[in-house]
């Protein structure tokens, strides 16, 4: 694994090939999670930020930007969208959590909570995923679509198998995240595919 502290993945062009596979040994279904990361893009079209598919299940967990100020979370192919007033283009810190027992999903943008939404109450997110940055999967680890590809920079990505309390979300935003047990930017197992470059994080 690699400590990517102070670094980002740069996706320099629109493509149907360039992506990063994030590797986790996640063995049991997710009843809860929190995902946090930083992103910087000047795309005004829709694009995928974090694509998690399992065998035979598309959009099992997907974080998707519909347009400026609109973030969507897919759980088991169901979708909720939250809105925020944001500058464009500008760096953003995104956290999203979801709790199976209540179905509540919550985005936090730059340390501020958006309106809570609900989806897939009682559902468990399947384990053994293929996780992709830079492209939106329409199959298990593949079938990408150029029009949904990400162009920009992504860093400081952490994923926990619990819903973090607000103080821990704010810690992540401020750059001091808790140790993460699904994906941890400080100990990341990944594979770069195509034209993706690791560069210093200069926009925080």
């Amino acid at each position: 694994h690699t400590d990517l502290s102070g670094k980002v993945f740069v996706f320099p062009r629109e493509s149907v090939t360039d992506h990063v596979n994030l590797i986790t040994p996640l063995e049991k279904p997710l009843q809860n999670f929190t995902l946090c990361f930083r992103a910087y893009s000047d795309l005004s079209r829709a694009y995928s930020l974090f694509s998690y598919n399992t065998q035979g299940r598309d959009n099992e967990l997907l974080v998707y930007k519909e347009r400026v100020g609109e973030y969507s979370l897919y759980i088991g192919r169901h979708k909720v969208t939250s809105k925020v007033i944001e500058k464009f283009p500008a760096p953003v810190h995104i956290c999203v959590s979801w709790e199976s027992s209540s179905g509540i999903a919550e985005f936090w943008i730059n340390g501020t909570p958006l309106v809570k939404k609900g989806l897939r109450q009682g559902y468990f997110v399947e384990a053994q995923p293929k996780i992709v940055l830079g492209q939106e999967q329409d199959s298990y680890g593949g079938k990408f679509d150029r029009s949904q590809s990400f162009v920009g920079e992504i860093g400081d990505l952490y994923m926990w198998d619990s819903v973090l309390p607000p103080e821990n979300i704010l810690s992540a935003y401020q750059g001091t995240p808790l140790p993460a047990n699904i994906l941890d930017w400080q100990a990341l197992n990944y594979e770069i595919r195509g034209y993706v470059i690791i560069k210093p994080l200069v926009w925080v």
Partner: antibody, heavy 119, light 107 residues
Framework: QVQLVQSGAEVKKPGSSVKVSCKAS????????MHWVRQAPGQGLEWMGM????????NYNEKFKSRVTITADKSTSTAYMELSSLRSEDTAVYYC????????????WGQGTLVTVSS | DIQMTQSPSSLSASVGDRVTITCKAS??????VAWYQQKPGKAPKLLIY???YRYSGVPSRFSGSGSGTDFTLTISSLQPEDFATYYC?????????FGQGTKLEIK
Amino acid sequence: QVQLVQSGAEVKKPGSSVKVSCKASGYTFTSYWMHWVRQAPGQGLEWMGMIHPNSVNTNYNEKFKSRVTITADKSTSTAYMELSSLRSEDTAVYYCARRNDYYWYFDVWGQGTLVTVSS
Amino acid sequence: DIQMTQSPSSLSASVGDRVTITCKASQNVNSNVAWYQQKPGKAPKLLIYSASYRYSGVPSRFSGSGSGTDFTLTISSLQPEDFATYYCQQCNNYPFTFGQGTKLEIK
């Protein structure tokens, strides 16, 4: 096989410093966080801090932050833990331990180094 | 810091016995708990990670359970080599912290 071999026992005076080494073999040293844990005689385990040898990023237990320095030498695959301003209560066995592949647990440990602080 | 409180602090048992050691965290640590075994003069060895997963090479008589604040290590049928001290550890928050240990002795 994966191994962590630590330096030998040390006897130190109060107020002095000690530097314990931990030489790694059998794996890619620069790919794993290295932790330091200590154990006072007859006592439990206490996490001191950690280093990633490639990025040289460190994280310390606040309790030791002002006195401990953890470093790594990539060329020799060796991690070091230096503790300054020693006092008698620092008498302990000091262990280095490697972080597991995917989780924040310690799957490989050094044999331990006894540091005795005595006037 | 998160306190990890183990009980009992010592325990006498016989070969073949079923033994349970508990660990209570002072706040929610989800399932981010490991159990280690330590024998006198030796370094600890990882037994259980993520509360319930047996580490590679660990005999199946060792099992772990729990989530949140309450965790359990169970040895289903004690073997002579199991007499040792056992520690729980949380890695949910920095600093990582350990329980004070449970010494398992031969009755």
